[in-house]
């Protein structure tokens, strides 16, 4: 039985040209995390974090995506096109798969504040 929950940073905003941390956290389960997949709103695969092999950042994003902190992902040099949904998929044993959603809004305004709080979707 899947008892865990994914907590995410929910809806966040960040300035164009800046950076943002996408973070998911799996709680309420003792399941072993074997892999975390990060996917972008246009269905591009950004990165995979395999428990044995470590991080694999897809070459198309290597110049703008940094692994971490933890199982999260840091997006750098943000553009307006980065606005949209991001998904973390936790592969666990023995529970199975958990999925979390984050919505990122990239703002032109220089007064945009980086806002983030953990949410349960």
């Amino acid at each position: 039985m899947m008892t865990g929950t994914i907590e995410t940073t929910g809806n966040i905003s960040a300035k164009k040209g800046g950076s943002v941390i996408l973070q998911c956290h799996l709680s309420s389960t003792m399941a072993q995390v074997t892999q975390v997949n990060w996917e972008q709103h246009d269905h591009s695969l950004l990165a995979i974090r395999n428990a044995e092999l470590g991080w694999h950042i897809y070459p198309a994003f290597k110049d703008r995506v940094a692994p971490g902190p933890g199982l999260g992902l840091t997006l750098q040099s943000l553009t307006m096109n980065d606005t949209g949904e991001y998904f973390c998929t936790y592969h666990t044993y023995p529970d199975g798969t958990y999925r979390g959603r984050i919505f990122l809004e990239v703002l032109e305004s220089s007064v945009a504040e980086h806002s983030a709080r953990f949410q349960i979707p």
Partner: antibody, heavy 121, light 106 residues
């Protein structure tokens, strides 16, 4: 020499689930750093990657197919399997299994000979 | 999704001639591009990886070039066994393949 061999029914009815198995010989499916993938080719058409799995059971899928795809692994038999649900005539194809060196950013280097699956009532 | 467009769809040549096949990506794939050869009833065979490196056992008449969005596979002098369909594949994001170029005997 690494060899891969696909097996499974050659005929599946529309709306049912296609199930195939790939048996790996000449090497261990548990060998570190390799994923194992499925690729298909409709008659007279091009190639389409379906998804891949690590021996731990962690997967990554083609976003356009992932709602219908499940890939699993049985390390004790040195096998991995594909299930594709709710099939239609458009899923008629030769299905190949292959070794996927994801973490080397490398192409599929070893392939099975392929098995034709026809979707028809 | 990174879309790969191959041209021409068909190339009609004679043995001994030079074949030049093109693959264009919808966005940069750097050098993460491979070429495969496929003959009827067979699985694809890896020819070139990382845009220009020949796979093990591939004859020197096969060469690859390009980076970014434009890539070329060249067969310097066609042998009878080279008449087949050729596919490019990118690895910069989740794997996608081009539509293929058929090299046929003229």
């Amino acid at each position: 020499q690494l060899q891969l061999q696909e097996s499974g029914p050659g005929l599946v009815k529309p709306s049912e689930t296609l199930s195939l198995t790939c048996t790996v010989s000449g090497g261990s499916i548990s060998s570190s750093s390799y994923y194992w993938g499925w690729i298909r080719q409709p008659p007279g058409k091009g190639l389409e990657w379906i998804g891949s799995i690590y021996y731990s059971g962690s997967t990554y899928y083609n976003p356009s197919l992932k709602s219908r795809v499940t890939i699993s692994v049985d390390t004790s038999k040195n096998q991995f399997s594909l299930k594709l649900s709710s099939v239609t005539a458009a899923d008629t194809a030769v299905y190949y299994c292959a070794r996927d060196p994801l973490y080397q950013d490398a192409p599929f280097d070893y392939w099975g000979q392929g098995t034709l699956v026809t979707v028809s009532s | 999704e990174i879309v790969l467009t191959q041209s021409p769809a068909t190339l009609s040549l004679s043995p001994g001639e030079r074949a030049t096949l093109s693959c264009r990506a919808s966005q940069s794939v750097s050098s993460y591009l491979a070429w495969y050869q496929q003959k009827p009833g067979q699985a694809p065979r890896l020819l070139i990886y990382d845009a220009s490196n020949r796979a093990t056992g591939i004859p020197a008449r096969f060469s690859g070039s390009g980076s970014g969005t434009d890539f070329t596979l060249t067969i310097s002098s066609l042998e009878p066994e080279d008449f087949a369909v050729y596919y490019c594949q990118q690895r910069a994001n989740f794997p996608t393949f081009g539509g293929g170029t058929k090299v046929e005997i003229k």
